[in-house]
């Protein structure tokens, strides 16, 4: 038993041209989260096949709002590790899928909406208990940087978490027949509890006397490779008991990889590189089918017509992608004219129009200058979807038809008297006040009380009135 740990370091635009559009905006803030899916063996990416080793979801990251005009930066990430516990042995070879999801937090009808931003996949060999392995994967214009490791849960140790170690009873040596638990030399290998003869490299046990096999091995002692084809007759004396040993001295002799996979020898076993559409330790598993439920967001799955396309997802309105995983951002095409606000309701698109405009796409201007005259030399100005007249001096009103009284608003302070003038207005101030609007009291010594200096500026500072 143990835990696979994944640390996401960064998710952002990859190098080179074609930087991706920020996934979030001021209008539609969002946050990221990640999903990891693990499968044993060296299976090729099969997006929605079962995550036989386990899967995990991260927490949600901080809310992010795009800065207008700025390029998409590395996006804020969730805290902490993604942890995938495994109950049995760590297989040593595994496949991973890491998905970056966006949770939109805007004015959504029916709660937040999720969409898949990027998916990366790979095949790796990894010893449990080893150091953190760093990786960089690219998906389109996005780049994901991460580290991963597998660690055993005590008392399990070793690169497959199949050996049990206990602290030494004596400081100098282990008990009779027991070796140090390399690389943990301060501990000793626990007494053998598996069934006698259980293969130490292909078998393991969790209870005394049992012998459970790692993927690719079978038999009571896990010494027999799983065959991908039925053997018609035994080959050689050692295969008489099973009839299905890989023929020849090398593990790739007779090519154990099915479906056109190519075989490579490893230090103690073999690995298959599988063609498209196949995965598994021996490329024995064909592509995803509808039984695996590969269609997201209510997509309808139907069986594909050819082997390379095992299924097809028919997506509901508002979603696209081979797995209906992408939310169609129909608002990105800016269908609402004249500054209208776009709302994607899933089943339909709606434009919320600014004042003065109407129509499904806010294309109709309700109030413009066409055919409208402004009297007394005024000029018509369009703005914000409603027309207005900029009137000549001395006139006002919607169409500049009213004679303006500049004194109507009582602009002269402290009892000053207002006089209309061809150039505007003049204030005659009451005794003790001065200024264009009689706003400043005159001190008895003749100095005027000017406005106080703003906070942080000394009196006498030249900018104090800026």
């Amino acid at each position: 038993a143990g835990v696979f740990e994944l640390q996401i370091h960064s998710f952002g635009p990859g190098p080179g041209p074609g930087a991706p559009r920020s996934p979030c905006s001021a209008r539609l803030p969002c946050r990221l989260f990640f999903r990891v899916c693990l499968k044993p063996g060296l299976s090729e990416e099969a997006a929605e096949s079962p995550c036989a080793l386990g899967a995990a979801l991260s927490a949600r990251g901080p809310v992010y709002t795009e800065q207008p005009g700025a390029p998409a930066p590395d996006l804020p990430l969730p805290d902490g590790l993604l942890q995938v516990p495994f109950r049995d042995a760590w297989p040593g070879t595994f496949s991973f899928i890491i998905e970056t999801w966006r949770e939109e937090l805007g004015d959504q009808i029916g709660g937040p909406a999720w969409s898949l931003l990027a998916r990366v996949a790979g095949r790796r060999r990894l010893a449990a208990g080893g150091p953190w392995a760093r990786d960089i994967q690219r998906a389109g214009a996005w780049e994901l940087r991460f580290s991963y490791r597998a660690r055993c849960e005590p008392p399990a140790v070793g690169t497959a978490c199949t050996r049990l170690c206990r602290p030494r009873s004596a400081p100098s040596r282990c008990g009779p027949g027991l070796r140090p638990c390399a690389p943990l030399e301060d501990e000793c290998e626990a007494p053998l509890v598996c069934r006698a003869g259980c293969s130490p490299e292909h078998g393991f046990c969790e209870q005394p006397g049992e012998c459970r096999c790692l993927e690719g091995w079978t038999g009571p002692l896990c010494t027999v490779p799983v065959s991908t084809s039925s053997c018609l007759s035994p080959r050689g004396p050692s295969s008489a008991t099973t009839g299905c040993l890989v023929p020849g001295p090398g593990p790739c002799d007779g090519n154990p990889c099915a479906n056109g996979g190519s075989c490579s020898e490893t230090p103690r076993s073999f690995e298959c590189t599988c063609p498209r559409g196949f995965y598994g330790l021996r490329c024995e598993v064909s592509g995803v089918t509808c039984a695996d439920g590969p269609c997201f967001n209510g997509g309808l799955c139907v069986g594909g017509a050819d082997p390379d396309s095992a299924y097809i997802c028919h997506c509901p309105p508002g979603f696209q992608g081979s797995n209906c995983e992408k939310r169609v951002d129909r608002c990105s095409l800016q269908p609402c004219r004249n500054g209208g606000l776009c709302l994607d309701l899933g089943h339909a698109l709606r434009c919320r129009c600014r004042a003065g405009f109407a129509g499904p796409r806010c294309e109709h201007d309700l109030d413009d200058c066409a055919g409208r005259a402004c009297a007394n030399g005024g000029t018509c100005v369009e703005g914000g979807g409603a027309h207005r007249c900029s009137c000549a001096l001395g006139f006002g009103g919607r169409d500049c038809r009213e004679r303006a009284d500049p004194c109507a608003a009582r602009p002269c302070a402290h009892g000053g008297r207002c006089y209309a003038h061809f150039s505007g207005l003049v204030c005659a101030c009451a005794p003790g006040y001065m200024g264009a609007r009689c706003e400043f009291p005159v001190h008895p010594d003749g100095a005027s009380a000017l406005p106080a200096a703003p906070p942080g500026l000394r009196p006498g500072d030249p900018q104090r009135y800026l």
Partner: antibody, heavy 124, light 106 residues
């Protein structure tokens, strides 16, 4: 203390079979996770991996030389043997044996102890 | 087969300098192993499982990398570090070595 020591004929003629022996102490080739490998190095050149044998008799050979190589062991006498058939001058090199540790599954921890090497010259 | 390319082939450094050598791999591997060899001596294990120092290796050495790019770094090189360093992969047979990086001390 782990030690390994190689021995061989020193000089032999083309087309003969080269027989090498690796005698070791400090570990047992009956112990799970233990292996012994052979590596060679022509004078002034780099290292070339040849073959290895594990405690459970799993063997690996360099595919380029596989048809000429045979590796075997005698765990009770702590020896590993390598035979190279039909040698020629290109097989002139220093031959090393080394212990390999792979405690679990299919991942090598380290090739952690090496012998001092034995020099082999093929000439007519 | 997996080919390991070491660079540079030869490097010269003064004592106290930081030295980094790289090992590029034609196909992704999970771990890299490094060996040190001095003239007329057998190779010594130096770094295993990418970043673990073998017994007796000074802490000024470090290993890092993943996938197809690995490196060995000496933070402050000393005269005794003059040697040839080989990288090796244990992913696929043949378990190949790099051609070596020779470190000379000025």
């Amino acid at each position: 203390q782990v030690t390994l020591k190689e021995s061989g004929p020193g000089i032999l003629q083309p087309s003969q079979t080269l027989s090498l022996t690796c005698s070791f102490s400090g570990f047992s080739l009956s112990t799970s996770g233990m292996g012994v490998g052979w590596i060679r190095q022509p004078s002034g050149k780099g290292l070339e991996w040849l073959a290895l044998i594990w405690w459970d008799d799993v063997k690996r050979y360099n595919p380029a030389l596989k048809s000429r190589l045979t590796i075997s062991k005698d765990a009770s006498s702590s020896q590993v043997f390598l035979k190279i058939a039909s040698v020629d001058t290109a097989d002139t090199a220093t031959y090393y044996c080394a212990r390999i540790a792979s405690y679990d599954y299919d991942v090598v921890y380290a090739m952690d102890y090496w012998g001092q090497g034995t020099s082999v010259s093929v000439s007519s | 087969q997996i080919v390991l390319t070491q660079s540079p082939a030869l490097m010269s450094a003064s004592p106290g300098e930081k030295v980094t050598m790289t090992c590029s791999v034609t196909s992704s591997v999970s771990y890299m192993y490094w060996y040190q060899q001095k003239p007329r001596s057998s190779p010594k294990p130096w770094i295993y499982l990418t970043s673990n120092l073998a017994s007796g290796v000074p802490a000024r050495f470090s290993g890092s990398g993943s996938g197809t790019s690995y490196s060995l770094t000496i933070s402050s090189v000393e005269a005794e570090d003059a040697a040839t360093y080989y990288c090796q992969q244990w992913r696929n047979n043949p378990f190949t070595f790099g051609s070596g990086t020779k470190v000379e001390i000025k």
